[in-house]
């Protein structure tokens, strides 16, 4: 029995609903009484949802899953996952048994956009050319881990003296703090770009130092 799922991961934003598509081709005369359908987590084999003996057996996964009962007879074994959270990310296996047996796995990629970065400067007063300053770029509650890029006012990448840390909060979302140590020129703009690699979403922050005062666009 051929079971079909999408090749590419299903991308879902945290808090939204996702559909994990799975289909099979029922033979003429097929009835739901013949169908055994199991969704499980591929990595741990934990049961997620099942259908057997003509009945939806319900969600075994935090009561956040549902089948599409009206579409099962047409070979649609897709699973609806509600209120997606970081802990859902991973591979789900769809097992279908009628007379024959088939299975396939579909990946769920969870994502959350990063906030607009906030910029802080240390020290933040009495700055002169030649002073070493620490610029911190902070962006919050994104997923998965961000890519962080720094550049100067001319668009030249700044790769030295950068330290980036990413810590997950209780919801599994990452807070990113990237620190650039730089020797000040006469004046200058320093920008950080926080990129979500899954959403291809960029969040920008910058600070311009012009002797006195400083501005934070």
């Amino acid at each position: 029995l051929e079971v079909q799922v999408p090749e590419d991961p299903v991308v879902a934003l945290v808090g939204t609903d996702a559909t994990l598509c799975c289909s099979f081709s029922p033979e003429p005369g097929f009835s739901l009484a013949q169908l055994n359908l199991i969704w499980q987590l591929t990595d741990t084999k934990q049961l997620v949802h099942s259908f057997a003996e003509g009945q939806d057996q319900g969600s075994a996964y935090a009561n956040r899953t549902a089948l599409f009962p009206d579409l099962l007879a047409q070979g649609n074994a897709s699973l609806r996952l509600q209120r997606v959270r970081v802990a859902d990310e991973g591979s789900f296996t769809c097992f279908v048994s009628i007379r024959d047996f088939g299975s396939a796995a579909v990946s769920l990629q969870v994502a959350a956009p990063y906030s607009k970065p906030s910029m802080t400067l240390e020290p933040n007063k009495d700055l002169r050319p030649g002073d070493t300053v620490t610029i911190t770029c902070s962006s919050y509650r994104g997923y998965p881990e961000a890519e962080v890029f720094w550049q100067d006012g001319q668009g030249v990448p700044l790769t030295g003296n950068v330290t980036t840390s990413q810590m997950a909060n209780e919801q599994g979302l990452f807070d990113v703090h990237s620190v650039l140590r730089v020797v000040l020129g006469a004046n200058g703009t320093y920008s950080c770009l926080v990129r979500n690699p899954v959403l291809q979403q960029d969040a920008h922050g910058s600070v311009t130092i012009t002797g006195q005062p400083m501005t934070f666009p």
């Epitope: 090749e7 590419d8 991961p9 987590l41 591929t42 990595d43 741990t44 084999k45 934990q46 996964y61 935090a62 959270r85 970081v86 802990a87 859902d88 990310e89 991973g90 591979s91 796995a105 579909v106 990946s107 990629q109 969870v110 997950a168 909060n169 209780e170 919801q171 599994g172």
Partner: antibody, heavy 119, light 113 residues
Framework: QVQLQESGPGLVKPSQTLSLTCTVT?????????WNWIRQHPGKGLEWIGY???????SYNPSLQSRVTISRDTSKNQFSLKLSSVTAADTAVYFC????????????WGQGTTVTVSS | DIVMTQSPDSLAVSLGERATINCKSS????????????LAWYQQKPGQPPKLLIY???TRESGVPDRFSGSGSGTDFTLTISSLQAEDVAVYYC?????????FGGGTKVEIK
């Protein structure tokens, strides 16, 4: 900053049940994490025992499944390990550890507690 | 279960020199849908719990010095310490995070020559 701390008796008699508790501070055990038990036999490698997830579901190492129970007390922000019918082969350092979602690597560990099985 | 085999068992390297540890899995740890290898590396010092260094084969954990790097794909993986420091003396473990039960290699002890 999340911290994990194991506690329980350091000496258990053969055939009895080993009971350990892991207390989690600064993070709720109902957040999007799995809470694991891992052990290390003296001078040897690491063995994953099992986990309890944010939702309360559990999974155990098949090699220990018949003897292991992992449970939790959300009001105390603790999770516990029970290993029954212990023998000298269960003498080890027992660690609790946290993994993010279904990323099954272990980011935060407790310091570990030594359990000796001996009469 | 996936069996993880590390080599060598121990390794003596001069300060400032490169240390290379190998890890082989009994089946592929590459997930085709996201092209990620589900392998982690840990460092353990005496009397301490293991410390996560690398996950997804090559992603450095926050705060880990960039002299530590991970590479490899499928069944063959390597942890490299580009310039060994005194504080790197420890036992290093690989772990597959692909399929339960999660399993570890037997460890490689790194010492100063």
């Amino acid at each position: 900053q999340v911290q994990l701390q194991e506690s329980g008796p350091g000496l258990v008699k053969p055939s009895q049940t080993l009971s350990l508790t892991c207390t989690v501070t600064d993070y709720s055990i109902t957040g999007d994490y799995a809470w694991n038990w891992i052990r290390q036999h003296p001078g040897k490698g690491l063995e994953w025992i099992g986990y309890i997830s944010y939702s309360g579901s559990t999974s155990y190492n098949p090699s220990l499944q018949s003897r292991v129970t992992i449970s939790r007390d959300t009001s105390k922000n603790q999770f516990s390990l029970k290993l029954s019918s212990v023998t000298a082969a269960d003498t080890a350092v027992y660690f609790c550890a946290r993994s993010l979602g279904r990323r099954w690597y272990f980011v935060v560990w407790g310091q570990g507690t030594t359990v000796t099985v001996s009469s | 279960d996936i069996v993880m085999t590390q080599s060598p068992d121990s390794l003596a390297v001069s300060l400032g020199e490169r240390a290379t540890i190998n890890c082989k899995s009994s089946q592929s740890l590459l997930q085709s849908s996201n092209q990620k290898n589900y392998l982690a590396w840990y460092q353990q010092k005496p009397g301490q719990p293991p410390k996560l260094l690398i996950y997804f084969a090559s992603t450095r954990e926050s705060g880990v010095p960039d002299r530590f790097s991970g590479s490899g794909s499928g069944t063959d993986f390597t942890l490299t310490i580009s310039s060994l420091q005194a504080e790197d003396v420890a036992v290093y473990y690989c772990q597959q995070h692909y399929s339960a039960p999660w399993t570890f290699g037997g460890g490689t002890k790194v010492e100063i020559k």
